[in-house]
Amino acid sequence: YPYDVPDYAGGGGSGGGGSMMTGTIETTGNISAEKGGSIILQCHLSSTTAQVTQVNWEQQDQLLAICNADLGWHISPSFKDRVAPGPGLGLTLQSLTVNDTGEYFCAYHTYPDGTYTGRIFLEVLESSVAEHGARFQIP
């Protein structure tokens, strides 16, 4: 992939001077999935006409992926084997492990509004537990 940077830690920021941030981020909220399975992380930005210049997907302070308006997708090298871009601006996590449990963030960098951030909490369950219907309620 053409991205030419040695380290991808951290998150992003762009935005809009003086404009009101009218948009809202809708996410899948709290979700659970089986160990070994896959899950789609989705955020949707609505109620704004701002131009999306980049979307960053982060797990805590680790950058998973970037979707840039000019350059398309970049998946961080350490996640290449288990992260797939899409659908849309979402992200698919594969071969899930219990260590994947935690908070995930989508950061929509827009002009002129600024940065909109959405939060998703993922719990990866042992398959037997997941089969018995232990699920978080999506708010």
């Epitope: 940077v5 830690a9 992003g12 920021g13 951030t117």
Partner: antibody, heavy 119, light 107 residues
Framework: EVQLVESGGGLVQPGGSLRLSCAAS????????MHWVRQAPGKGLEWVAF????????YYADTVKGRFTISRDNAKNSLYLQMNSLRAEDTAVYYC????????????WGQGTMVTVSS | DIQMTQSPSSLSASVGDRVTITCRAS??????LAWYQQKPGKAPKLLIY???TLQSGVPSRFSGSGSGTDFTLTISSLQPEDFATYYC?????????FGGGTKVEIK
């Protein structure tokens, strides 16, 4: 090694024009957004303009909007700033700076070129 | 525009001292703050981005913290090469704006 070299500065009269250039080397220029930032003598830093890697996003500070034009030629690894209707308050060192890929801060800067607007 | 206020505007310190510089944004910028070092006649150098992430090649004596409106740059043990002016910059919103700078001088 990442290198950014500005040129084109000089003395110009109020109302005049100047075109600054920034020659980039040591990285894949076409993958990076680029900024112009200026610094008036003895003062702090002021962001001037930004252009994304493929030129689809171009933004200006209000102080230069309508007078300055940022552009780039990825085939020539070059960034430009066309400055028209120059004013005394535009006197500054002008830096080109590369934007980090993962977010919009400036990770490499050129040495700067001095622009003096005076009659 | 978001105003960035740095304090102090200047300070005197000795080699080995722990130095703290603060930066306050006029509204929340989440974690999106960068710190730069500038020496006389030279271009700024990126030290910290995204509030607390150390730029590659920057010594570990530099650290950043904070989120929302209040941020701190700390130099744990000041070295001779650290005497310079330090600027904060928000990268959450256009236009990107810088603090007024903090000059760190030799005591």
């Amino acid at each position: 090694e990442v290198q950014l070299v500005e040129s084109g500065g000089g003395l110009v009269q109020p109302g005049g024009s100047l075109r600054l250039s920034c020659a980039a080397s040591g990285f894949t220029f076409s993958n990076f957004g680029m900024h112009w930032v200026r610094q008036a003598p003895g003062k702090g830093l002021e962001w001037v303009a930004f252009i994304s890697s493929g030129s689809s996003s171009i933004y200006y500070a209000d102080t230069v909007k309508g007078r300055f034009t940022i552009s780039r030629d990825n085939a020539k690894n070059s960034l430009y700033l066309q400055m028209n209707s120059l004013r005394a308050e535009d006197t500054a060192v002008y830096y080109c700076a590369r934007m980090r890929l993962d977010y919009y801060a400036m990770d490499y800067w050129g040495q700067g070129t001095m622009v003096t607007v005076s009659s | 525009d978001i105003q960035m206020t740095q304090s102090p505007s200047s300070l005197s310190a000795s080699v080995g001292d722990r130095v703290t510089i603060t930066c306050r944004a006029s509204k929340s910028i989440s974690k999106y703050l960068a710190w730069y070092q500038q020496k006389p006649g030279k271009a700024p150098k990126l030290l910290i981005y995204s509030g607390s992430t150390l730029q590659s090649g920057v010594p570990s004596r530099f650290s950043g913290s904070g989120s929302g409106t209040d941020f701190t740059l700390t130099i744990s043990s000041l070295q001779p090469e650290d005497f310079a002016t330090y600027y904060c910059q928000q990268h959450n919103e256009y236009p990107w704006t810088f603090g007024g700078g903090t000059k760190v001088e030799i005591k």
